[in-house]
């Protein structure tokens, strides 16, 4: 299953399959997730080691048993790959690293006014993988405001150095935020020239294209079909690049297919997995296990659940079957692709779904451990769980926020439905940033069921929580995916990085905002909060947040939306925007429904008809 815990001051011994430099443990974990054989990783921050060569070292590891011995190493961070972790799988990495220079091939230098602009330039340059920006206080005047666009053979820095007044980061192309746009066209009977960066075997051009999309240096590809004239080159997928970023020439060639990486697509990237099953095809590779199962779909599920399994073949040969079950061969290779592909067989083959974003219906397993007033504009995909709850009577208007917590579930505030309990009048918009982008053609979700907490009473602040079951499940994308729920009764975690988001009023007597707003607000103890609200009872099932001096808060229209906190690199839904005295008033914090206190209720209500939990929270 999905294991997200990080081990502080621990280093996994042995099992190395690759090493690289990464700026932090989260990026190292992402590289492990996308490496075909990596199950575990260990990261050495600069502070953890004197050896300059090993600073920022990210060590990717494999293990037949799924684990390795841990040794104590002060400052080191270790953990698991996020394979099998559904919506948490993403190659998108937005963080900016201050005081760090990520080295690589500098191929473009320009003057820009901010690190954000430098990151945008990198994202809009086809060859840029990461960048460094020298701030206005950099010690050498001639380098100030320089934006250096970079690449490297492996897509990660060739070295990382601590350097004052330098900020570094990665391209946001994997976040589907590139302005370049992509070529969806595939060209039949055409071969591209230029430099081959890798060669893998694939059953069709679509798998070849997805592999190209997630390969750090692939810009385009040529695939040789299973009837290509040279037998040894059949099913070969050549991943390619060029100086210009486009093929310098193409040659008409029977039984070849060519196309482009989809990494520069805006708003939608293909999933980093291949779910198609290929009948009459055998995939060869290193044998991991052989098991008897009923049907090819069960074989694929078995492969997906066995974390080291990369692909499989389900044999229908009479000698491989007994009763209704046949042999399911679970296999792996060094590069994650079959080492041999055979056609016209009695088998069906396919790939593990361990890297599919959708995962199962569960929301998230994590480690136990109102426009916004005074806020700023959010950017695409920054808060992909945020939804807008809108009512369509004669006109249509935004009324509340909400948080996507599963394919078919939204968590919001009960008071949003005061006087409007009819599910037919509601429209739920997900994956949006600007309310003005909503037109009559914009897809929306309808409500199947509104589940208001049984103890909620209108115009009281208690138990202000409601679940919405959507009529149809939503697919997950970089712009529309769920937020992890906290552990039941989560009291031990100290959250220091919390944000509230919404399209609500920007002042007490304001109006709904167009662009989703965000504001960073500190949590306030319940004791402190109670002092500020003498006339109300602040219960243990509430959480408060706000600045003593006011000025930043949720407001009308943000209700039901999320209060999220980042801990150990993972966002969790800590609160639901509920109520407050005015908005952003001095010494009047916002009051939020404490989600951790309602975990039993959430899990009980989201049980599917077959008894399987539709969301999963930490044990």
């Amino acid at each position: 299953g999905c294991l997200t815990q990080l081990y502080e001051n621990a280093f996994f011994r042995g099992g190395d399959v690759a090493s690289m430099y990464t700026p932090n443990a989260q990026y190292c974990q992402m590289r492990c997730t996308f490496h075909p054989r990596c199950l575990l990783f260990s990261f050495l921050p600069a502070s953890s080691i004197n050896d300059m060569e090993k600073r920022f070292g990210c060590f990717l590891k494999d293990s037949v048993t799924g684990t390795l011995p841990k040794v104590h190493r002060t400052g080191a961070v270790s953990g698991h790959s996020l394979k099998q972790c559904g919506h948490q799988i993403s190659a998108c990495h937005r963080d900016i690293y201050k005081g760090v220079d990520m080295r690589g091939v500098n191929f473009n230098v320009s003057k820009v006014s901010s690190v954000e602009e430098c990151q945008k330039r990198c994202t809009s340059n086809i060859r840029c993988q990461f960048f460094s920006y020298a701030t206005q206080t950099f010690h050498k005047a001639e380098y100030r405001n320089n934006c250096l666009l970079k690449y490297s053979p492996g897509g990660t820095p060739t070295a990382i150095k601590v350097l004052s007044n330098v900020e570094s980061g990665f391209s946001l192309k994997p976040c589907a935020l590139s302005e370049i746009g992509c070529h969806m066209n595939i060209f039949q009977h055409l071969a591209f020239s230029d430099v081959d960066v890798a060669r893998v075997l694939t059953p069709d051009a679509f798998v070849c294209r997805t592999i190209c999309t997630y390969h750090p240096n692939c810009l385009f590809f040529t695939f040789y079909t299973n009837v290509w004239k040279i037998e040894s080159q059949r099913n070969v997928c050549l991943l390619k690049t060029s100086e210009s970023g486009t093929p310098s020439s193409s040659t008409p060639q029977e039984n070849t297919i060519s196309g482009y990486s989809l990494l520069t697509c805006k708003r939608t990237l293909p999933e980093p997995c291949h779910s198609k099953i290929y009948p009459g095809v055998d995939f060869g590779g290193e044998e991991l296990n052989v098991t008897f199962v009923k049907g090819v779909n069960v074989c694929q599920e078995t492969c997906t659940k066995m974390i080291r399994c990369q692909f499989f073949t389900y044999s229908l040969l009479p000698e491989d079957c007994k009763e209704e079950k046949c042999k399911c061969f679970l296999r792996l290779s060094m590069d994650g692709s079959p080492t041999r592909i055979a056609y016209g067989t009695q088998g069906s083959s396919g790939y593990s779904l361990r890297l599919c974003n959708t995962g199962d219906n569960s929301v998230c397993t994590t480690k136990t451990s109102t426009r916004i007033v005074g806020g700023t504009n959010s950017s695409w995909g920054e808060w992909p769980w945020q939804v807008s709850l809108q009512v369509k009577l004669t006109a249509q208007r935004h009324l509340c926020g909400g948080s996507l917590i599963g394919h078919q579930w939204v968590l919001t505030a009960a008071h949003c439905f005061d006087g409007l309990p009819l599910q037919d009048v509601w429209r739920i918009y997900s994956g949006i940033l600007n309310l003005s982008d909503i037109t009559k053609d914009t897809p929306f979700s309808q409500i199947k069921e509104i589940i208001i907490h049984q103890n909620y009473k209108v115009s009281e602040g208690n138990h202000d929580i409601a679940l919405i079951k959507l009529q149809a499940p939503l697919n997950y994308t970089e712009f529309q995916k769920p937020i992890c729920l906290p552990s039941k009764g989560d009291t031990s975690t100290i959250y220091t990085n919390c944000w509230v988001t919404g399209w609500g009023f920007s002042k007490e007597k304001g109006e709904i905002q167009n662009i989703l707003q965000k504001v960073n607000i500190p949590l306030v103890t319940n004791e402190e909060c109670q002092k500020r609200y003498q006339d109300y009872k602040i219960t243990q099932r509430m959480v408060c947040a706000g600045y003593k001096e006011g000025g930043k808060d949720a407001c009308k229209g943000d209700s039901g939306g999320p209060l999220v906190c980042k801990h150990n690199g993972m966002w969790r839904l800590v609160g639901i925007t509920s109520w407050g005295e005015g908005c952003a008033r001095r010494e009047q914090p916002g009051v939020y429904t404490k989600v951790a206190e309602y975990m039993d209720w959430i899990l009980e209500k989201t049980q599917s008809s077959d008894g399987k939990a539709q969301m999963q929270s930490p044990a």
Epitope: M184, N185, I186, Q188, H189, D204, A205, F206, T225, N226, V227, N255, I257, P270, E271, S275, K276, I277, P279, G280, V281, Y343, G344, T345, Q346, T358, N475
Partner: antibody, heavy 118, light 107 residues
Framework: EVQLLESGGGLVQPGGSLRLSCAAS????????MEWVRQAPGKGLEWVSS????????IYADSVKGRFTISRDNSKNTLYLQMNSLRAEDTAVYYC???????????WGQGTMVTVSS | DIQMTQSPSSLSASVGDRVTITCRAS??????LNWYQQKPGKAPKVLIH???TLESGVPSRFSGSGSGTDFTLTISSLQPEDFATYYC?????????FGQGTKLEVR
């Protein structure tokens, strides 16, 4: 010119049999998956069966499984559909089609009519 | 089996109009989606494969887009010869299934 030409259709009684043929020309027949698709009068398209280039792998729609058999003779550049235990609901125009490199049915025959009636 | 749902089932339009036909798959099919045109008494003809790749010889006024479950066929400026029935089809998994068709008629 790339071409597919079906033959063998006609009127047959329920429970009867018929063998359809599809002659291919203008391309390397043994390089491609081949398909049979049918269309009942006034209705939409329904995929019937598929065969791999070597003939080693065959797939059928549930509606015809156990009654129809797809085969090919690469030396004769010909695709076949043996239809047994025919029913009234099998009445349709039957098309043979080539599955192209990108899995679309890129070349179609002109179709042959099969009528199952007593 | 994967169900393919086309909308609308029929459409009246005039020469020069921009026309859009949508196709929804009951589960994600990546870009394994093809569009066909069929005229009365004739065999279908492929227009677009892999969701957006135009078949050679097909006029550029035809375009396709989409991935996953939602797909669109657009005719940017309708010509007299475009009045026909259009089908989408998934080639993601067997049984390969077609949409029920969209009949494009003269207004």
């Amino acid at each position: 010119e790339v071409q597919l030409l079906e033959s063998g259709g006609g009127l047959v009684q329920p429970g009867g049999s018929l063998r359809l043929s599809c002659a291919a020309s203008g391309f390397t027949f043994s390089d491609y998956d081949m398909e049979w698709v049918r269309q009942a009068p006034g209705k939409g398209l329904e995929w019937v069966s598929s065969i791999s280039p070597s003939g080693g792998s065959t797939i059928y729609a549930d509606s015809v499984k156990g009654r129809f058999t797809i085969s090919r003779d690469n030396s004769k550049n010909t695709l076949y559909l043996q239809m047994n235990s025919l029913r009234a609901e099998d009445t349709a125009v039957y098309y043979c089609a080539r599955q192209g490199l990108l899995t679309a049915f890129d070349i179609w025959g002109q179709g042959t009519m099969v009528t199952v009636s007593s | 089996d994967i169900q393919m749902t086309q909308s609308p089932s029929s459409l009246s339009a005039s020469v020069g109009d921009r026309v859009t036909i949508t196709c929804r798959a009951s589960q994600s099919i990546n870009t394994y989606l093809n569009w066909y045109q069929q005229k009365p008494g004739k065999a279908p003809k492929v227009l677009i494969h892999a969701a957006s790749t135009l078949e050679s010889g097909v006029p550029s006024r035809f375009s396709g887009s989409g991935s996953g479950t939602d797909f669109t066929l657009t005719i940017s400026s309708l010509q007299p010869e475009d009045f026909a029935t259009y089908y989408c089809q998934q080639s993601y998994s067997t049984p390969y299934t077609f949409g029920q068709g969209t009949k494009l008629e003269v207004r």
